[in-house]
Interface confidence: low
């Protein structure tokens, strides 16, 4: 598999991972102990047709074209968990793996 | 996990699973032995912000909105594979299992 | 006791190979990230590379073609293989896991051993 | 690839005054740095991640700063304890997967 990293001064218009903090903190999400802030990551960018697609069924829904079928969009294609220290809803601390926080790889599908 | 499915007649915006078939003699796709067609559903509608959002991630990147985040699109987020008999590049018959061919479940991601 | 324990560092001739060990104990190898980071005599410290969760390996681009990261979780050890070694490649040799730090980070080395010492001489 | 300049070089300072060092990347890192302590003999000890979080078991007198390209590390108050060389660190690009130390910070106490 393959995806594109960018950053704020890329040029790159295609469908592209790009950096990102998330600052729980700045949201003021006061239940999560840790981590305050981690690198999530995000997709960003045009999917052309072909480009970085994931799975055969992206080029073949686009071959039958279906009413309403929108193209491809740049969306996660990889991601991975992270550890959490949080509060619960009854205020018991919860240590847990959070599936899917970060984004690894860009693709269009 | 939660999906919606809908049909032809379904009024439905939001992010929705819609039945396809997939015809591979229609696409002239000869080198396929079997199946000649299948189902392989698609994913299509709105994703207005939280509405079956997979991920955690994509509401995180939401708060965050770093520049050029488009929101979330309608993707498929569960997929199955299929058996197939087809001709390989050398004219070799292959009998395969092939990855994320049919939509199973559509979401925001 | 969570620990790292490298090995196999002494004098190599310029041209020779060596390969070091990087024995762990207290965890479980294959969920962390494993780097080697090198220090010169009286210099600062450089990174060589990292094996992954998933046994990937990526490196310095000087470190390409000539050293290799490795991985034995039955020995929870980890290894550098390195050849082709020159007077300059002289360096105390650590081993370091990367950092649980709650988030995601590959680079965040928290734990490290006390180091081998790799000279390079004729 | 990204390059990391530290400076000073070398600082020297009297216990209980306050240490302030620079930390500057060649391009934008976001908050991708780490900084960490090392003495004569030891392997480097981890200090701070993400600019400003506090590793485990490292006193609150530490505390880092900074986004983009530019980074201080900050010591309140030094103790003798803290005199030692001091590194920032990357990560080379998004991919998490490549390392870039400063050439380190000196601190002496006078």
């Known amino acids: 598999d393959f995806g594109l990293d960018c950053d704020e001064h890329s040029t790159e218009s295609r469908c592209c991972r790009y950096p990102l903090t998330v600052d729980f903190e700045a949201f003021g999400w006061d239940w999560i102990i840790a981590p305050k802030r981690y690198k999530a990551n995000y997709c960003s960018g045009e999917c052309e047709f072909v480009f970085l697609q994931k799975y055969p069924h992206t080029h073949l829904v686009h071959q039958a074209n279906p009413r309403g079928s929108a193209g491809p969009c740049c969306t996660p294609t990889k991601m991975s968990p992270i550890n959490m220290l949080y509060f619960n809803g009854k205020e018991q601390i919860i240590y847990g793996k959070i599936p899917a926080m970060v984004v690894d790889r860009c693709g269009c599908s | 996990d939660f999906g919606l499915d809908c049909d032809e007649h379904s009024t439905e915006s939001r992010c929705c699973r819609y039945p396809l078939t997939v015809d591979f003699e229609a696409f002239g796709w000869d080198w396929i032995i079997a199946p000649k067609r299948y189902k392989a559903n698609y994913c299509s509608g709105e994703c207005e912000f939280v509405f079956l959002q997979k991920y955690p991630h994509t509401h995180l990147v939401h708060q965050a909105n770093p520049r050029g985040s488009a929101g979330p699109c309608c993707t498929p987020t569960k997929m199955s594979p299929i058996n197939m008999l087809y001709f390989n590049g050398k004219e070799q018959i292959i009998y395969g299992k092939i990855p994320a061919m049919v939509v199973d479940r559509c979401g925001c991601s | 006791e969570v620990q790292l324990v490298e090995s196999g560092g002494g004098l190599v001739q310029p041209g020779g190979s060596l390969r070091l060990s990087c024995a762990v104990s207290?965890?479980?190898?294959?969920?962390?990230?494993k780097g080697w980071v090198r220090q010169a005599p009286g210099k600062g410290l450089e990174w060589i590379g990292i094996?992954?969760?998933?046994?990937?390996?990526y490196y310095a681009s000087w470190a390409k073609g000539r050293f290799t990261i490795s991985r034995d979780n039955s020995k929870n050890t980890v290894y550098l293989q390195m050849n082709s070694l020159r007077a300059e490649d002289t360096a105390v040799y650590f081993c370091?896991?990367?950092?649980?730090?709650?988030?995601?980070?590959?680079?965040?080395?928290?734990?490290w051993g006390q180091g081998t010492l790799v000279t390079v001489s004729s | 690839a990204v390059v990391m300049t530290q400076s000073p070089a070398t600082l020297s300072l009297s216990p209980g005054e306050r240490v302030t060092l620079s930390c500057q990347a060649s391009?934008?890192?976001?908050?991708?740095l780490s900084w960490y302590q090392q003495k004569p003999g030891q392997p480097p000890k981890l200090l701070i991640y993400?600019?400003?979080t506090l590793a485990s078991g490292v006193p609150s007198r530490f505390k880092g700063s900074g986004s983009g390209t530019d980074f201080t590390l900050t010591i309140s108050s030094l103790q003798p304890e803290d005199a030692a060389t001091y590194y920032c660190?990357?990560?080379?690009?998004?991919?998490?997967?490549?390392?870039?130390f400063g050439q380190g910070t000196k601190v002496e106490i006078k």
């Open positions: 370091a896991r990367g950092h649980d730090n709650f988030g995601y980070s590959y680079h965040d080395f928290n734990l």
């Open positions: 207290g965890f479980t190898l294959s969920h962390y990230v």
């Open positions: 094996i992954n969760i998933e046994g990937e390996t």
């Open positions: 391009q934008s890192i976001h908050h991708d």
């Open positions: 993400l600019a400003s």
């Open positions: 660190q990357t990560y080379d690009g998004i991919s998490h997967y490549g390392v870039a």
